[in-house]
């Protein structure tokens, strides 16, 4: 019996087609992805093959103005239109709190939404009961397939699930659910979830009875043969893991942002064992037509976005200096504003010992592309922020050793004075440079804001200590020459859309007046 699994993950609000790098589509003839194009390909495959499941491994939420405006209603609407069969909860599905998940998505989705390792407690337990499930048995042709969901247990550090959801260890939570499916005579089981490729592989290895793992969170690109675009494969598709009980378990992920549609063909024997598996992600490039009916629906929903872009988010009573002349040479108040917003967006008081789990922000000055003038009645709009942060990036959470941070700050000024983009703006950090010293030895003082303290204060950076830092995904990926971050980071979790972070902060503050306050000094 053959099953075709079509899968997406980490779509992050890319409802419209995007450029090849998943930013805003500029030249339509070169654009990719989007739900209208995805629908065309899904329908083609449904037409051609008998037993097809369309699955999503989480993180539909967060990433573009679509989510900012529609807050998840767009996800439910278009996933319903594409007739998804199941979705796993990702960490970003909790970005607007549990209510922001329940109302727009859980109550509106016409497909099951899954996670076996999230347990509700207190008053939420009855409110959310039945709205998401640990597993679902789906009829496919003449057979049944069990789908069991999982979500990163780090979600409380990455999003806003509140205090009434407990995120258990994935493997511990999955095993009893898979065992239950077995007792129900379901012998073909897919683990669908959002914990990253390393955990996906562990689940394949450790959870008895899981036949296939469809994952997300780490934006992993797997491919067999010559890859069709810029993404470099982390391994073959599917990635085969030998389980502890000796089975060959295919593990798949389909990069991110709706650029690819994962296509996995599985052959099962009559006892539900995987005999063979093959496939590849399908690049959704512009040679695949956008479905006109879905496209028309997208255009209808778009109208509200255009209106939103020009509405006031808040006011500034000072000039927001985002000029290259400032932000690539010295501390600039636009850099301070953005870093303060980044930290504010990551306030998660999850432990009595820590006032917060992260206190530091770094931001390449070259990523700040425009100032905002306060003389326009102080008004700040989404459109203004899009000029400051035009690249559609995310502000991510990483873990780095102190020694890596020191290298990053040396790199920040290694060729100072040439208006290059690697000069770092900061938050929760005090740095002093001596430019008379030779490159690689110019950081004379580097103090960082403590987290394990009741009264935050600045302490010298410790080389061997592991620190959490918020930074742009561009830096996490080694951009602007920050190879040491890419090479030495110990953990990387993708965060919220950059503009969304700053706009939320401005809306919350209502009136802002960021200053230049001595975060960066030259001796």
């Amino acid at each position: 019996w053959e099953l075709t699994i079509l899968h997406t993950n980490d779509v992050h609000s890319r409802l419209e087609q995007t450029s090849e790098d998943s930013s805003k589509c500029v030249n339509a003839s070169r654009c990719m992805g989007g739900v209208a194009r995805l629908f065309t390909k899904v329908q083609q495959i449904r037409r051609a093959e008998p037993n097809v499941l369309l699955l999503d491994a989480g993180d539909q939420y967060q990433g573009t103005i679509w989510f900012t405006v529609y807050k998840g209603a767009e996800v439910a609407h278009f996933m319903n239109a594409l007739r998804y069969d199941a979705m796993a909860l990702g960490n970003h599905e909790f970005d607007n709190g549990v209510e922001g998940l329940i109302e727009p998505l859980l109550k509106e989705a016409k497909f099951p939404i899954l996670s076996a390792n999230i347990k509700a407690k207190g008053p939420l337990a009855s409110q959310i009961s039945g709205l998401y499930l640990p597993y679902k048995v789906l009829p496919v042709g003449d057979e049944v397939v069990g789908i069991v969901g999982y979500t990163s247990k780090e979600t409380p550090f990455l999003s806003n699930p509140g205090t009434n959801l407990v995120f258990e260890d994935e493997i511990t939570a999955l095993q009893p659910e898979v065992d239950k499916l077995k007792t129900l005579n379901v012998n073909k089981i897919i683990a669908l979830g959002h914990s990253g490729f390393e955990m996906d592989k562990l689940i394949a290895q450790k959870v008895r009875g899981v036949d296939v793992v469809v994952g997300g969170h780490s934006n992993t690109f797997l491919y067999t043969g010559n890859p069709p675009s810029k993404e470099v494969p982390a391994g073959k598709y599917p990635f085969i893991v030998t389980s502890d009980d000796g089975r060959k378990v295919p593990v798949v992920q389909a990069y991110a942002f709706g650029k690819y549609l994962g296509y996995l063909k599985i052959e099962f024997d009559e006892r539900g064992n995987v005999i063979s598996s093959h496939g590849n992600p399908i690049l959704l490039n512009s040679s695949i037509p956008e479905d006109p009916s879905i496209k028309a629906d997208i255009n209808k929903w778009r109208i509200k976005l255009d209106n939103y872009s020009t509405q006031e988010l808040g006011k500034t009573i000072v000039y927001l200096d985002g000029s290259s002349q400032s932000c690539r040479f010295r501390e600039c108040n636009m850099g301070n504003l953005i870093c303060d917003a980044m930290i504010n967006n990551n306030l998660r008081h999850t432990d009595e010992m820590f006032w917060n789990h992260v206190s530091m922000c770094i931001l390449n000055g070259g990523g700040i592309r425009s100032p905002i003038d306060e003389r326009n009645n102080g008004t700040i709009t989404w459109e203004n922020l899009a000029a400051v942060l035009p690249f559609g990036g995310t502000f991510d959470l990483v873990q780095l050793k102190g020694s890596t941070l020191k290298k990053a700050f040396e790199h920040s000024v290694h060729r100072y004075g040439q208006s290059t983009g690697e000069f770092l703006q900061v938050g929760g950090i005090h740095v002093v440079y001596d430019l008379s010293r030779k490159p690689g030895d110019r950081v004379v003082k580097l103090d960082v804001l403590c987290t394990k303290c009741r009264v935050p204060s600045y302490d010298p950076l410790k080389m061997d200590e592991v620190y959490k830092v918020i930074l742009p995904n561009f830096l996490a990926n080694g951009g602007d020459g920050f190879q040491m971050i890419k090479d030495e980071l110990l953990r990387h979790d993708s965060g919220d859309q950059d503009i969304n972070v700053v706009s939320t902060y401005i809306s919350k503050m209502k009136v802002i007046y960021p200053a230049v306050e001595g975060r960066i000094k030259f001796s």
């Epitope: 065309t40 051609a48 093959e49 008998p50 512009s286 040679s287 037509p289 479905d291 496209k295």
Partner: antibody
Framework: QVQLVQSGAEVKKPGASVKVSCKAS????????LSWVRQATGQGLEWMGE????????YYNEKFKGRVTMTRNTSISTAYMELSSLRSEDTAVYYC??????????????WGAGTTVTVSS | DIVMTQSPDSLAVSLGERATINCKAS??????VAWYQQKPGQPPKLLIY???YRYSGVPDRFSGSGSGTDFTLTISSLQAEDVAVYYC?????????FGGGTKLEIK
């Protein structure tokens, strides 16, 4: 290399049936769609329907519904098109053409050489 | 059914000159349009798929453009071997339909 080899020419009487074969080689037969297209002498191209060998799913042009049957034998990588209740206007060259539904080339990338079917009393 | 209206029915162009063939769909077909070349006694050959993508091995003098309802095949510099009948086809909805063809000759 990819090849679609069709059966030889047929002469049929009105009311009879004809079955044309199309043997595929050089690719995985079950991973592509196969369409049948006909062309009357000096006329344009007319799509009759398609079969997906992997599933056996078929989709026919409404114009031929009830008269056309498309089948396949995956063990010998061959597709068949049977047209019944033949009339003189069915005289045409019948082509099979491959369609890569998993790829992105929206069109028929390989064609058979064609089978001439003549319907005459 | 979606009707594909091709124009002109026939076209005579001097060697080295540009030839342009148009195709109009009766409804929005996005970019799901292919162009074929057919020479006497031969099956059609795929030139352009998805409105503007040149099929592998097709000379770069052939190009396609358009989306929605209006499509164009252009031969930038006509060669003797380009004499043939050219067909457009929509691949958006079944039944997949072809244009009536354009016969291209040398002036």
């Amino acid at each position: 290399q990819v090849q679609l080899v069709q059966s030889g020419a047929e002469v049929k009487k009105p009311g009879a049936s004809v079955k044309v074969s199309c043997k595929a080689s050089g690719y995985t037969f079950t991973s592509y769609g196969l369409s049948w297209v006909r062309q009357a002498t000096g006329q344009g191209l007319e799509w009759m329907g398609e079969i997906y060998p992997g599933s056996g799913n078929t989709y026919y042009n409404e114009k031929f519904k009830g008269r056309v049957t498309m089948t396949r034998n995956t063990s010998i990588s061959t597709a068949y098109m049977e047209l019944s209740s033949l009339r003189s206007e069915d005289t045409a060259v019948y082509y099979c053409a491959r369609y890569d539904y998993l790829g992105s080339s929206y069109g028929f990338d390989y064609w058979g050489a064609g089978t001439t079917v003549t319907v005459s009393s | 059914d979606i009707v594909m209206t091709q124009s002109p029915d026939s076209l005579a162009v001097s060697l080295g000159e540009r030839a342009t063939i148009n195709c109009k769909a009766s409804q929005d077909v996005s970019t799901a349009v292919a162009w074929y070349q057919q020479k006497p006694g031969q099956p059609p050959k795929l030139l352009i798929y998805s409105a503007s993508y040149r099929y592998s091995g097709v000379p770069d003098r052939f190009s396609g453009s358009g989306s929605g309802t209006d499509f164009t095949l252009t031969i930038s510099s006509l060669q003797a071997e380009d004499v043939a009948v050219y067909y457009c086809q929509q691949h958006y909805n079944t039944p997949y339909t072809f244009g009536g063809g354009t016969k291209l000759e040398i002036k």
